[in-house]
């Protein structure tokens, strides 16, 4: 602790100039003071100052009033400087004295004199408020007043509360009175050296260095630091955590940049013809009758889609088709028969049944068997029931569809999740392709799991080739090349005339 | 107890860019309340304070050096680093790394043993 | 910019008071630390926030800080505490050392 025990000499009384032993001054008392201050005694006791002790030079003969100065010699307020905790007691003695001698500095004169002494006891607050007192005895009256403050950057009851205001990175405050520190606006924490971050900044994503400032952490950005950036090469989709590449609808592939909807955004199929997506990229367009080609864009011949029946033989005509009927049967198409059951017209085991008074039949066909005489074998597969690239195959009376890896279900229906089981490390983004999972890594790892990190930037050679893009963190070898069209390869350095289904992984 | 220790070349040329590394064991460097600090003293010379960086990568620079000097905080390694670029014979010095810490107003409680850097050609 | 101002070097008998004094305008309004170093060994702080010791440094240490001084005293001088001493204060964002003083125990 660190304070002053200020005394404050106000009037001084000595009208006949009179000394303690009851000796006059000649020619009148030449008076200055000495003051003793110590810890509190009940009975004060001669013995060292203890709180201080200081002298006056000569502030008046006899009776005079003392007045204020603030520096030099004949200082007054008179300062008792102590470096202690204030205890809240003391004892003060006040002496005059008469001196024959030098006036600036009569403690060292010989002959000096005790004119009068008080001695005061008791208790006393720190505190600015001055507390005035008046002590007389017979001879002599004395005003005074006195407190205890504490010296600069000390503070409380004791002043000893060290608290100096600082304004640097140890520390943004000033001091309150008892000397608790009171933070500069935009700053908070025990000793003030935390900064209060913009308003909203996110709590995890962001911080600060110094006030309304948002800072985001890797892998954040906005204003508050709370959206996700996805992962670098992200095309059609969003993230809801760092890194992460969420494919919007209709878009598939590690960075969504495969369209699974090509159908709806490119409208490919030509001739009213049906278009079906069939995965990135891929779709089939089925025709209608008299067209042909990938994209239904051919004009087929009129024949082309067998329209006469019962072994009737087509013949192309300018606008239209002529269908020449084998002997019993008639009609545009050959579809009427001048056949009746006892012709026996049914194959393969057909029942025959009269229709029409037996001017004409049907044939009821047996399993597998079909046609208006049952001369087709029945293809199950003909209605393409095996979905997601499914392999249709005839078993006899039945048929299986053979799945494509990742699929399974009758029609291949289902689709196996090989992230389920979470195969990617390091906190990996988990992807089903065809082929199986694939793992988008976050910055600084690689490989087919994310299990490598990555000490070095493999893209950083230009190992790609033909415009396509690098990118880090996606295999064991740490880049892939994603081809333009037209090229493959695992640095796409080989042309084609096909465009692949997936980058390449170098 | 926290330890320091100063790693980097002993020698470097005029011209060149002296790098130095502080790992830090025993602590985190990412604890708040503290910087961490680069002083440097010449040979038969005084200490000079050349800056201090905290793990969010707040940085304090002498501005006597501040146009050559960067700090930097790697808290995945527990380190952190200084370059000084553009040097002369006159930063051949003792180079200590330190903590400076918030409760002790700044006061540095731990250095490390210090590294000699000498700026030769 | 602001400078620390030390004697640089002090005598001192083996059981007396070495005060150590540090100068810098309106020093006595940041806190003064003090460093002691030993030939070839680096700083250790003995004296912050003015008075206060840090654990494992003797009691004979000790220190105030006024006006535009701070004093290191050390009282009953052993010849262990031969050694240069720095005075420390922070001048807004920036570190500032004095220039050392030596004490030599006799």
């Known amino acids: 602790g660190s304070g002053i025990f200020q005394l404050r000499l106000q009037e001084f009384v000595n009208q006949r100039g009179m000394l303690a032993n009851g000796q006059s001054c000649e020619p009148g008392c030449r008076t200055f003071f000495r003051i003793c201050l110590k810890h509190f005694q009940a009975t004060f006791s001669e013995g060292p100052c203890t709180f201080g002790n200081v002298s006056t030079p000569v502030l008046g003969t006899n009776s005079f009033v003392v007045r204020d100065k603030n520096s030099g010699s004949g200082r007054n307020p008179l300062q008792l400087p102590f470096n202690f905790t204030w205890p809240g007691t003391f004892s003060l003695n006040i002496q005059a004295w008469h001196t024959p001698g030098d006036d600036l500095r009569p403690e060292t004169s010989p002959g000096n004199s005790l004119i009068s002494q008080i001695i005061i006891q008791g208790s006393l607050a720190v505190g600015k408020i001055w507390r005035t007192d008046e002590q007389n005895d017979t001879l002599t009256r004395l005003s005074y007043s006195y407190r205890v403050i504490c010296s600069d950057n000390y503070y409380g009851e004791s002043c000893s509360r060290l608290c100096k205001k600082r304004d640097d990175h140890f520390g943004h405050y000033e001091c309150q009175p008892d000397g608790s520190l009171s933070c500069l606006p935009g700053w908070t924490g025990k000793y003030c050296d935390q900064p209060i971050c913009l308003s909203g900044c996110h709590e995890q994503n962001g911080y600060c260095s110094k006030p309304d400032e948002c800072i985001c952490r890797p892998g954040w950005q906005g204003r508050l630091c709370n959206e996700c950036i996805p992962h670098n090469g992200c095309r059609h989709g969003t993230c809801s955590i760092p890194w992460q590449c969420a494919c919007d609808e209709g878009w598939g592939g590690l960075f969504c940049d495969q369209d699974l909807n090509y159908c709806t955004h490119h409208s490919p199929c030509k001739n009213g013809s049906t278009c079906s997506n069939s995965g990135p990229k891929g779709y089939t367009c089925t025709c209608l009758p008299g067209y042909t080609g990938e994209h239904c864009e051919l004009g087929l011949s009129k024949c082309a889609s067998n329209p006469c029946r019962n072994g009737g033989s087509c013949k192309d005509q300018e606008n239209s088709y002529h269908c020449l009927c084998p002997p019993g049967y008639y009609g545009q198409h050959c579809e009427h028969s001048t056949l009746t059951c006892a012709d026996s017209p049914c194959f393969n085991g057909g029942s025959c049944r009269e229709r029409n008074q037996g001017s004409s039949y049907a044939c009821e066909c047996p399993p597998n068997f079909t046609g208006s005489n049952c001369e087709k074998k029945v293809d199950r597969c003909t209605s393409n029931p095996c979905a997601n690239g499914g392999q249709c195959q005839n078993r006899g009376p039945s048929r299986t569809c053979r799945c494509r890896p990742g699929f399974t279900g009758t029609h291949c229906e289902l689709h196996i999740s090989d992230c389920a089981r979470s195969p990617c490390a390091h906190g990996g983004t988990c992807h089903d392709l065809e082929n199986g999972p694939v793992c988008t890594c976050p910055a600084g790892f690689s490989g087919r799991r994310c299990e490598v990190r990555i000490t070095h930037d493999a893209c950083a050679s230009g190992p790609c080739f033909n415009g396509a893009t690098c990118y880090t963190g996606l295999s064991p070898n740490n880049f892939v090349c994603n081809c333009p069209y037209g090229f493959v390869g695992s640095r796409c350095e080989f042309p084609v005339g096909l465009p692949p289904s997936f980058p390449w992984v170098a | 107890e926290v330890q320091l220790q100063e790693s980097g070349p002993g020698l470097v040329k005029p011209s060149e860019t002296l790098s130095l590394t502080c790992t830090v064991s025993g602590g985190s460097i990412s604890s708040s309340g503290y910087y961490w600090g680069w002083i440097r003293q010449p040979p038969g010379k005084g200490l000079e304070w050349i800056g201090d960086?905290?793990?969010?990568?707040?940085?304090y620079y002498n501005p006597s050096l501040k146009s050559r000097v960067t700090i930097s905080v790697d808290t995945s390694k527990n380190q952190f680093s200084l370059k000084l670029s553009s040097v002369t014979a006159a930063d051949t010095a003792v180079y200590y790394c330190?903590?400076?810490?918030?409760?002790?107003?700044?006061?540095?409680?731990?250095w490390g043993q210090g590294t000699l850097v000498t700026v030769s050609s | 910019s602001y400078e620390l101002t030390q004697p640089p070097s002090v005598s001192v008998s083996p059981g007396q008071t070495a005060s150590i004094t540090c100068s810098g305008q309106?020093?006595?309004?940041?806190?003064a630390s003090w460093y002691q170093q030993k030939p070839g060994q680096s700083p250790v702080l003995v004296i912050y926030?003015?008075?206060k010791r840090p654990s494992g440094i003797p009691e004979r240490f000790s220190g105030s800080n006024s006006g535009d001084t701070a004093t290191l005293t050390i009282s009953g001088t052993q010849p262990m505490d031969e050694a240069d001493y720095y005075c420390?204060?922070?001048?807004?964002?920036?570190?500032?050392f004095g220039y050392g003083t030596k004490v030599t125990v006799l």
């Open positions: 420390q204060a922070w001048d807004r964002d920036t570190g500032v």
């Open positions: 309106r020093l006595g309004d940041k806190y």
């Open positions: 330190a903590r400076e810490d918030v409760i002790l107003r700044g006061g540095s409680d731990y």
């Open positions: 926030e003015d008075s």
């Open positions: 960086i905290n793990y969010r990568g707040s940085t």
